[in-house]
Structure formats: structure tokens, C-alpha cells
Interface confidence: low
């Protein structure tokens, strides 16, 4: 426990102290006091440097004194023979004696008292930065106006820390600038910009005057910049010694201004700004950048647009452009996105045609569609060549993205009809000579295939059976052969509106407009035995002249049989209508004058007994196309006749082309390609 005073006596005092003794006393007075130690008696064996016996006074690590020998007071009014004054509150006294004493020595008597110390003046190191105030047992520090006492209760400073600057540009100055800055202060300023900007400090030479360095080159007052692990400074002196611009490469900067107690100058003023991080102008193939600039910096946004034929693929979605932003780290966003060649994908297949598997389906690749020749041709032109276009579609120069249509070639038999041995007014024929020939089994009749979905026949064939069964592709109509041929299923029968329906068809005398169309449920596949006949053109080239030859075919009555099992055909000439009028009607059901002859009818035959007959109805009267000798068109349809083996009457198809086209158009269903 600290005490205010005390006594210290050598062992056995006032008797002689013993040999070989070492004893110590720890003196402690209260905090804030010093110690006055004084000796009133001193009788210790004398030796050089008090080596034998001694009393030692120690303050901390410092020896305040070492005593031996005899002392007496110089002052008759004071008993004090030796004294010590220490400004500390602790002191140690150590007494030592060696193994022998030549004489008898009585030792020492000493006293200590606590004394007030003046902390403001008694120490080399001044305890207060500004004003020091002593009191008994302690002191306190105080500050001049506008200064405040720091937490250490010793140092005064100005309130110049804690400012945080976040604006992209700004100005910072030392306190009171350009008046002298405060002494003994530490000012800290923080600049915190958003990521993507580096702090650039600009300090003009003339805006800087800070107490110069000492002889060793150490700044007494200093300005330091700290950016992450990089430090700029310390700077001091008259005129800024650093660079005009300090590029910190960081968005965070700490500015530390430290001053000592002496030598105040005007200080400093600086400007800073946020310099956006640059992003490199990258070479992105197959694209253009907008806007185009020499330099891109943080927050710049560019639109990267792919060149024609290239696209950005992200997941499953294709786009032609994307935005990229210069980011805070100096890298572009969306940098993984690239302009890749557009992929048009596997081309769609087409009915009755094919496309070779392409080597590549990327932009610029070329494919070729072909139709199944010689039975189909490309209706809508364009040559069948498509290239992979920039929009990801296969495109043809003529058709654009529209696919080619393979439509049946009409009027071209695989084998031409040649009249062989004569068979009662006609010859045996093969279905390949007349691949358009359609067989109706009820009533036994014929028809002509004009495209994939439509059969042309005579109205009187279908008026009594609106769901006829039809066959194509067979020369023979024996039941066993028909089973192997292609059966056609009707969807709807369209009889010409000008055909007069009768309650008793057997008594018919008016065969005007004897024409009908049968729409098929499914398209017919063309080949060597199944192929359509052409329709006549509407020009005068297709007006028949007397003597023009045409071919008829069918399984109708011959001179030997009511019905033919194998296909028969004949070549016969067009005749004037009067020739047909002049023939006496066989088994008339009415007066000869009642039979109607109209311009919608063609009269043909009369040569060598060649004629169509019962069972041939609806079959085509095929005439060579005047504009393309390789093709046949349906000039007529077997309609009626006054007498088999003479002249026959055929519906003049040319007069019905408009009706045929209109009916087909209005009743076509979109193809499911």
C-alpha cells in the first residue's frame, strides 16, 4: 500500500550491522507524488566505489545514488546528511555488507516523505501538447480555442477527420487553408468512389506548403496517400514534391495529414476526380460495334450487331445483336457471347421430291431440291437451289423461303401407244400407254386422272353413284389384277351445274355438259403406270379441227364382248358434228329429233369402225398438245353415241377448263407438307 512517509533503518541500527547482509526496501507513495528521501545518519564501511558495503538508491532502472563512509550535516539547523528527490512515486533502497568489517559500523537511518511534483516543468518530456496545469498530486492538460483534448487527455488537436468523399470529383484542403494548419493534429480523409473508377489526385506545386523535413530527411509534418497496399508519400516541404497527377488505380483512397507541435505553414489543397476504368476494344469477329469509339471506359454501353448470316446463340434463343457494358473491373459484360454463323438446320422434306443431306447447314451453305423425275417436276420454278440466308431460312432466289412444289408431269405416257394387230375397231393397249386411264367398276366406265387429287369423268357415269370405286395403274381389270392395283377413294363428286339430272336417266336425249370431277380422299402417287393427262389450254391453239387425231382408251364393249378385261385403245379423227347427227340412233329411246347436239360436244370416229362404246364413258379423248408434241391433253371425254362402231360424241373439255380450275381451287385442302 502506498504511504505518504516512512523510516528506513539499517539492520540492528543503531548497533553495528552484521556481515554478509543484503536487504532491500520498496518505497511507494500515491500516484501523482514524488519521493523525498533523506539520510540523518550514515556510518558504513568506506571503500572505492562503495564496493564492500553500501546503501543503493534505485529509481526504475536508474541508480540515483550509492552511499558509504561517514557523513555529517553541513547545516547546524538540519540533521540531513544526504538527500534525494525523485519525481516518481516508487523507489528502491538496497543495503549490502560484505563478509568482514575491520571496524564497528552502525549503518544508516533514512526517512522518506511524499512530495508534490510539477509534471508541467519537472520532466524533459512535456506531458501536454498545449497547456499544462499542475495541482498537488497531479496535473491536467487544456487546449486553446477551437482545439479539443484527445482521449489520451494530453494532446490537443483540431477536428479534421471523418470526412468521406463519394462524389466523382471534389476538392480537399488542410484545415484553415490557406491560413496555417493546426499543430499536433492527425487529419484523415477518405475518398470512396463506386467501383469502376480510380481516384486521380491532382496537386499543383503552388498549392502545397508543409513544414520541411529534418536534417535526416524525415518529414516533421507530412501528407500521405494510401490506396489499398500502395502508399504515396509522405510528402512535405515548400512546393508539392510529388507528381502532378497521382493515379491510385483504386476507387478507395485514404489521405493522412500529420502535424507536430511546431512550424505551421499554409498547408495544402488538392483536387481529385474519378477516372473511369478503360475496357479494351476487343476484336469480336463477324460483328460491328455501335457506337464506334477510339476508347471505351466504365459504364460505356455498346451494341454489338452480328453481320448478316451470323447470330448470337444464348441457350436456345438466337438474336442478331446484344448489349455489352464496360464493367468496373475493366472487362466487358456478355464477353462470352459471340456472333456465330446462322444455322438453318436440316432442310424440310417435300412431297414427291428429295433434298440431298447437306454437308453443312450454316450460313452460305447450298442445298438442291429435286423432284422424282420423270413423273414429277418443280411447279413453282426457282431451279430447286436454296442457300442458308442470314435470317436462318433456306432461301431460293425466285421463291424466297417458300419450298418448291413437285407436281405430277401430265400427258406423257411411259410407252407410246402403237396400233398392233387390228382387233375389231381397236387394239390392245398397255396401261403405260394411257397412265391417266381410270377404271370405274360401278357403273363400268372410265375416267381421266388430271392431278394427284382429281379425276375427270362424264357426268352420266357418276350421277347414279356418288361414291364410285376407282382403280388406276392396271392394264387388266380382272378382279385378281384389280386387287393388286391402286384403288382410289372418292371424297366428293362434283357434277357440272349445267348437267340436267333426270328421274329416268335411261331415256336421256340431252348429254350437254356431260362432265364431272371426283375429288379423291388421298393423293395419288405417280409412276410409270399412273400419271395424269393435261388439260387443254384456253388459247385458239387448242381448238380442234376436223381430221385432228385423238386417242381413246377403255374397257368398254367390243364387237366380241360386252366388257373388255384388258385395256383397248384406238386412234380416231375429229369429224364434223353433222356426221354424228346423220348416224341413225341404235335402239332409240326417243324420237331422233329429240337428241341434243351442242358446241360443247366433239364428234369423232367413223374410220375403220373405230369408236368408243358402252363402258368407255368418261375416258379421255387424248390429243397431242400443239405446243409440246411429247404431251397429250384431254380434248374430250367419252360421252354418248348414236351407234357403236360409227361416230361418237365427246364432251369438249376446253369449254369447261374454267369450271374445272374453279372447282378444284375452291375444294382443295392445304397440303400437309
Amino acid at each position: 500500500e502506498p504511504t505518504m512517509y516512512g523510516e528506513i533503518l539499517s539492520p540492528n541500527y543503531p548497533q553495528a550491522y552484521p556481515s554478509e547482509v543484503e536487504k532491500s526496501w520498496d518505497i511507494e507513495v500515491p500516484e501523482g507524488y514524488g519521493i523525498h528521501l533523506y539520510f540523518t545518519h550514515l556510518d558504513i564501511e568506506l571503500s572505492e566505489n562503495c564496493a564492500y558495503d553500501s546503501v543503493q538508491i534505485i529509481s526504475g532502472d536508474t541508480e540515483e545514488g550509492r552511499l558509504c563512509g561517514q557523513r555529517s550535516s553541513n547545516n547546524p539547523h538540519s540533521p540531513i546528511v544526504e538527500e534525494f528527490q525523485v519525481p516518481y512515486n516508487k523507489l528502491q533502497v538496497i543495503f549490502k555488507s560484505d563478509f568482514s568489517n575491520e571496524e564497528r559500523f552502525t549503518g544508516f537511518a533514512a526517512y522518506y516523505v511524499a512530495t508534490d511534483i510539477n509534471e508541467c516543468t519537472d520532466f524533459v518530456d512535456v506531458p501536454c501538447s498545449h497547456f499544462c496545469n499542475n495541482f498537488i498530486g497531479g496535473y491536467f492538460c487544456s487546449c486553446p480555442p477551437e482545439y479539443f483534448l484527445h482521449d489520451d487527455m494530453k494532446n490537443c488537436g483540431v477536428n479534421c477527420s471523418g470526412d468521406v468523399f463519394t462524389a466523382l470529383i471534389g476538392e480537399i484542403a488542410s484545415p484553415n487553408y490557406p491560413k496555417p494548419y493546426p499543430e499536433n493534429s492527425r487529419c484523415e480523409y477518405q475518398i470512396r468512389l463506386e467501383k469502376g473508377f480510380q481516384v486521380v489526385v491532382t496537386l499543383r506545386r503552388e498549392d502545397f506548403d508543409v513544414e520541411a523535413a529534418d536534417s535526416a530527411g524525415n518529414c516533421l509534418d507530412s501528407l500521405v496517400f494510401v490506396a489499398g497496399d500502395r502508399q504515396f508519400g509522405p510528402y512535405c516541404g515548400h512546393g508539392f514534391p510529388g507528381p502532378l497527377n497521382i493515379e491510385t488505380k483504386s476507387n478507395a483512397l485514404d489521405i493522412i495529414f500529420q502535424t507536430d507541435l511546431t512550424g505551421q505553414k499554409k498547408g495544402w489543397k488538392l483536387r481529385y476526380h474519378g477516372d473511369p476504368m478503360p475496357c479494351p476494344k476487343e476484336d469480336t469477329p463477324n460483328s460491328v460495334w455501335e457506337p464506334a469509339k477510339a476508347k471505351y471506359v466504365f459504364r460505356d454501353v455498346v451494341q454489338i450487331t452480328c453481320l448478316d448470316g451470323f447470330e448470337v446463340v444464348e441457350g436456345r434463343v438466337g438474336a442478331t445483336s446484344f448489349y455489352s457494358t464496360c464493367q468496373s473491373n475493366g472487362k466487358w459484360s456478355n464477353s462470352k457471347l459471340k456472333c456465330q454463323p446462322v444455322d438453318c438446320g436440316i432442310p424440310e422434306s417435300i412431297e414427291n421430291g428429295k433434298v440431298e443431306d447437306p454437308e453443312s447447314t450454316l450460313f452460305g451453305s447450298v442445298i438442291r431440291y429435286t423432284c422424282e423425275e420423270p413423273y414429277y417436276y418443280m411447279e413453282n420454278g426457282g431451279g430447286g437451289e436454296y442457300h442458308c440466308a442470314g435470317n436462318g431460312s433456306w432461301v431460293n432466289e425466285v421463291l424466297g423461303p417458300e419450298l418448291p412444289k413437285c407436281v405430277p408431269v401430265c400427258g406423257v405416257p411411259r410407252e407410246p401407244f402403237e396400233e398392233k394387230q387390228r382387233i375389231i375397231g381397236g387394239s390392245d393397249a398397255d396401261i403405260k400407254n394411257f397412265p391417266w386411264q381410270v377404271f370405274f367398276d360401278n357403273p363400268w366406265a372410265g375416267g381421266a386422272l388430271i392431278n394427284e387429287y382429281w379425276v375427270l369423268t362424264a357426268a352420266h357415269v357418276v350421277e347414279g353413284n356418288r361414291e364410285p370405286t376407282m382403280y388406276v395403274g392396271s392394264t387388266s381389270v380382272q378382279t385378281s389384277r384389280l386387287a393388286k392395283s391402286k384403288m382410289l377413294t372418292p371424297e366428293h363428286v362434283f357434277i357440272h351445274p349445267g348437267w340436267k339430272l333426270l328421274e329416268v336417266p335411261e331415256g336421256r336425249t340431252n348429254f350437254d355438259n356431260d362432265i364431272a370431277l371426283v375429288r379423291l380422299k388421298d393423293p395419288v402417287k405417280m409412276g410409270p403406270t399412273v400419271s395424269p393427262i393435261c388439260l387443254p389450254g384456253t388459247s385458239s391453239d387448242y381448238n380442234l379441227m376436223d381430221g385432228d387425231l385423238g386417242l381413246i382408251s377403255g374397257w368398254g364393249r367390243t364387237e366380241k364382248r360386252d366388257r373388255a378385261v384388258r385395256l383397248k385403245a384406238a386412234r380416231l379423227p375429229v369429224a364434223p358434228l353433222r356426221k354424228c347427227k346423220e348416224v341413225k340412233v341404235e335402239k332409240p329411246t326417243a324420237d331422233a329429233e329429240a337428241y341434243v347436239f351442242t358446241p360443247n360436244m366433239i364428234c369423232a370416229g367413223g374410220e375403220k369402225g373405230m369408236d368408243s362404246c358402252k363402258g368407255d364413258s368418261g375416258g379421255a379423248f387424248a390429243v397431242q398438245d400443239p405446243n409440246d408434241k411429247t404431251k397429250f391433253y384431254a380434248a374430250g371425254l367419252v360421252s354418248w353415241g348414236p351407234q357403236c362402231g360409227t361416230y361418237g360424241l365427246y364432251t369438249r373439255v376446253k369449254n369447261y377448263v374454267d369450271w374445272i380450275m374453279k372447282t378444284m381451287q375452291e375444294n382443295s385442302t392445304p397440303r400437309e407438307d
Epitope: A167, L168, I169, H273, G274, D275, P276, V288, E290, P291, A292, A294, K295, V297, R299, D300, V301, Q303, T305, S321, Y323, T325
Partner: antibody
């Protein structure tokens, strides 16, 4: 609210120079380019150039390279355009405009400054 | 520089009528931009990226086109649409069209 406030009309003599200003407010001035556009009855709208207020980098339309000088004063958030060697063909309304981070330039416009060159 | 041509300098339309104005570029560009300007005021950004409407632009406006041919369409004309419309490109150094003044009958 983003605002670009331009200086008032100017009547200047042929051969002289003029400096017009565009004070920005309501946004971080150094964050966006400032463009200048000329509008005259004869030539409709013409882009003069742009300046990056942070770096002071400029890009000019070739036609105006010898005519216009673009500068900024970051401390006052103000952009300037100086036009020199003025002739009657320079009589026009001049606009400053700010771009945006995204798909378009000229997102915000000043109210325009009418410059009349007349003896 | 890319030259933008607005062939119709002045056109008029009645309220409710459909209006289409065109702008052709001297060479192919990626996107077209349109501005609207009324007398005594600054131009306003109207359509960007060829077909996107700037904020506040009525849905009756639309933009379309590609390559060198672009157009701005108003599906049903209203009195407030009377103004001058400028086309603008920035595929190279920015340029503007001469403007089409749309008047109301």
C-alpha cells in the same frame, strides 16, 4: 431530374468567336458524354461532336473540326462549345445533349442557344 | 458519311387516318432512330433500335425497316402528333434526315 441548362442567345459579328455553355444537373456529370448538335433551316440537324467529361476525350464530326472546340469544367458541371471564325452560315440553334447508358444517344437535350452572326 | 433522305418534306393527315413516313439511307445501316420536334422545343427521342418506343411515346406509333429502307407509322393520327419527325443513324458518325413535317387537316 436530369437538366441541361444552356446559355442565352448570342449576336456576334462575322469573324468573331463565341463560347456557349451547358450546365448539367440532376446526375453525375462525369458519368456521361455530352454531345453538341447544330440545327439550321438549311441543313436540319447536324452532329458536331462529343466530349467525355471525366477524361476530356473528344470526338468531332470532320466538318466541324476546325470550327468547334469542346471543353468541360468539372467543378461547375458545365460543358462549353467555342465556335470561331464565324460566318452567316454558322447562324443556327445549337443544342447540348446527354447520352444514356444503353441503346441511344441524345437522350436528354438542352433548350438550345440561338447564335446569330450579323454585321 | 451516311446520308439519310426523308423524301416527303411536308405531309398532312386527318384525325384517325393512318400515316406512314419513310427514311432511306445511302448505305445499309443496322438500326434507325426517330426524333419528334415541335416548334420552339428541343427534339425528343421517339423511336430507337428501329422499332422500340421511347418511354412516354403512345402505342399508336411504330417503326420498322432494315438495310437502307425504314419507316415510322402512326396507326390513327391525333392532333398532338402534328410535329416534325427526324430520322437518325449512328452506324457511323451520327447523321440526321432532313425531317418530315406532319400537319393535321
Amino acid at each position: 431530374e436530369v437538366q441541361l441548362q444552356q446559355s442565352g442567345p448570342e449576336l456576334v459579328k462575322p469573324g468573331a468567336s463565341v463560347k456557349i455553355s451547358c450546365k448539367a444537373s440532376g446526375y453525375s456529370f462525369t458519368g456521361y458524354y455530352i454531345h453538341w448538335v447544330k440545327q439550321s433551316p438549311e441543313k436540319s440537324l447536324e452532329w458536331i461532336g462529343e466530349i467525355n467529361p471525366t477524361t476530356n476525350d473528344t470526338t468531332y464530326n470532320q466538318k466541324f473540326k476546325a470550327k468547334a472546340t469542346l471543353t468541360v469544367d468539372k467543378s461547375s458541371n458545365t460543358a462549353y462549345m467555342q465556335l470561331k471564325s464565324l460566318t452567316s452560315e454558322d447562324s443556327a440553334v445549337y443544342y447540348c445533349s446527354r447520352d444514356i447508358s444503353g441503346p441511344a444517344w441524345f437522350a436528354y437535350w438542352g433548350q438550345g442557344t440561338l447564335v446569330t452572326v450579323s454585321a | 458519311d451516311i446520308v439519310l433522305t426523308q423524301t416527303t418534306a411536308i405531309m398532312s393527315a386527318s384525325p384517325g387516318e393512318k400515316v406512314t413516313m419513310t427514311c432511306s439511307a445511302s448505305s445499309s445501316i443496322s438500326y434507325m432512330y426517330w426524333f419528334q420536334q415541335k416548334p420552339g422545343t428541343s427534339p425528343k427521342r421517339w423511336i430507337y433500335d428501329t422499332s422500340k418506343l421511347a418511354s412516354g411515346v403512345p402505342a399508336r406509333f411504330s417503326g420498322s425497316g432494315s438495310g437502307t429502307s425504314y419507316s415510322l407509322t402512326i396507326s390513327t393520327m391525333e392532333a398532338e402528333d402534328a410535329a416534325t419527325y427526324y430520322c437518325h443513324q449512328r452506324s457511323s458518325d451520327p447523321t440526321f434526315g432532313g425531317g418530315t413535317k406532319l400537319e393535321i387537316n
